[in-house]
Interface confidence: low
């Protein structure tokens, strides 16, 4: 009798991390059934013992939020899922080693685009994360990534774009034609960790020039 293949019950056990929200996800294998239950454990790299995650024991959903448990930026983590089918078969699969700093992806920034007659102003709002400092306050992406900067682009027409960038939060594209529509894209860049966020996009129209009416 050949040993059971864990992938029959359980596949693709991995962390999906975005802005330091760390979610463990997995898929059921071909032998998985709706009544298969899953139990989750995690541990810090270098530790011997696994810790059962409260709220993620004998669950039927295929995700578990481990943000709090994996919230130390200086540590590496593992998680594992044990699947148990109604028929009593079980399988356990472990994640690759997880570093939130290395593996988290960046969501688009939160931006306010403001139309003026001959300019468009863009204000980037700080991006909070679930990571907390020692005094309890939530850290922003800027607190964590020291070389983070913003890259802004304004599509003027099919062939011409204007670019701005920097660490500051307020930008303005000047010299624009009144009463004209423009497409703005804003991205977060972190060169040393080779990270780029998905772009925030705003379609804005400069105000009409009332001085001549």
């Amino acid at each position: 009798h050949a040993p059971e293949d864990p992938s029959d019950l359980l596949q693709h056990v991995k962390f999906q991390s975005s802005n330091f929200e760390n979610i463990l996800t997995w898929d059921s294998g071909p032998e998985g059934t709706p009544d298969t239950v899953y139990s989750i454990e995690y541990k810090t790299y270098g530790e011997r013992d696994w810790v059962a995650k409260k709220g993620c024991q004998r669950i039927t959903r295929k995700s578990c939020n481990l943000t709090v448990e994996t919230g130390n930026l200086t540590e590496l983590y593992y998680a594992r899922v044990t699947a148990v089918s109604a028929g009593g078969r079980s399988a356990t699969k472990m994640t690759d080693r997880f570093s939130s700093l290395q593996h988290t992806t960046l969501k688009p920034p939160d931006v306010t685009c403001i139309s003026k007659v001959r300019s468009i102003q863009m204000i980037v709002h700080p991006t909070p994360t679930p990571i907390r400092a020692g005094d309890g306050h939530r850290l922003t992406l800027e607190d964590i990534f020291h070389d983070l900067f913003y890259h802004l682009e304004l599509q003027v027409n099919r062939t011409y774009q204007m670019h701005l960038g920097g660490k500051q939060r307020e930008y303005e594209f000047f010299g624009l034609t009144p009463d004209t529509e423009f497409l703005g894209t804003i991205m977060i860049c972190v060169p040393t960790w080779a990270k780029e966020s998905a772009p925030y996009m705003c379609r804005v129209k400069t105000l009409p020039d009332r001085t001549w009416t």
Epitope: T74, S99, Q102, A133, H146, D147, G166, K167, Q168
Partner: antibody, heavy 123, light 110 residues
Amino acid sequence: QVQLVESGGGLVQPGDSLRLSCAASGFTFGSYFMSWVRQAPGKGPEWVSGIHISGGITYYLDSVKGRFTISRDNAKNTLYLQMNNLKPEDTAVYYCVTPPGPFKAHYNGMKYWGKGTLVTVSS
Amino acid sequence: NFMLTQPPSVSGTLGKTVTISCTGTSRDIGDYNYVSWYQQLPGLAPKLLIYKVNTRSSGTPDRFSGSKSGNTASLTISGLQSEDEADYYCASYRLYADYVFGGGTHLTVL
């Protein structure tokens, strides 16, 4: 209170190596970006190198890139600077420094300084 | 290695106001609000006075203030006291996480 104590300086010849250490206490070391700053006799300070809280990202002054390596051991609350192929122009007092608070980078200002350790490179 | 430009020396009269300038480029002072000022007394490590252009460090008297215009930052000391006689250094973030200091200014209190 915050204490930073540097050690490992001394007199060496050009081309030699030295390893500086900085023992930190009085604060949560693992939450602080750490830097080395040097000051040559009669000159102004010069930022040399910085290291992210994780130790995974390091920053260097152009003239020391490839020769100096900054590292940290958060379990031992210690910062290191490995200096290879030393040159006479590396002669300076080397300070271990931190920014004003946790999760702040070096460019937020250098609030806490050790007393420094003197490195002399001369033949 | 790049350095910000400061006057080598300035002097001021007891009780009066003095300003020390620090000139950089659009790649440092001009683009970023990460200018710091340090005071150094003989034989001691530098002491942080001002960071983020105009934020006073804990323990810095409110006689010290910082400002920035274009590529130039300034430290203003009002109500000069004899203990203010020292070397003053500016510093700024520079693109790609470098941090550059000025050459220093010696303040003499007359």
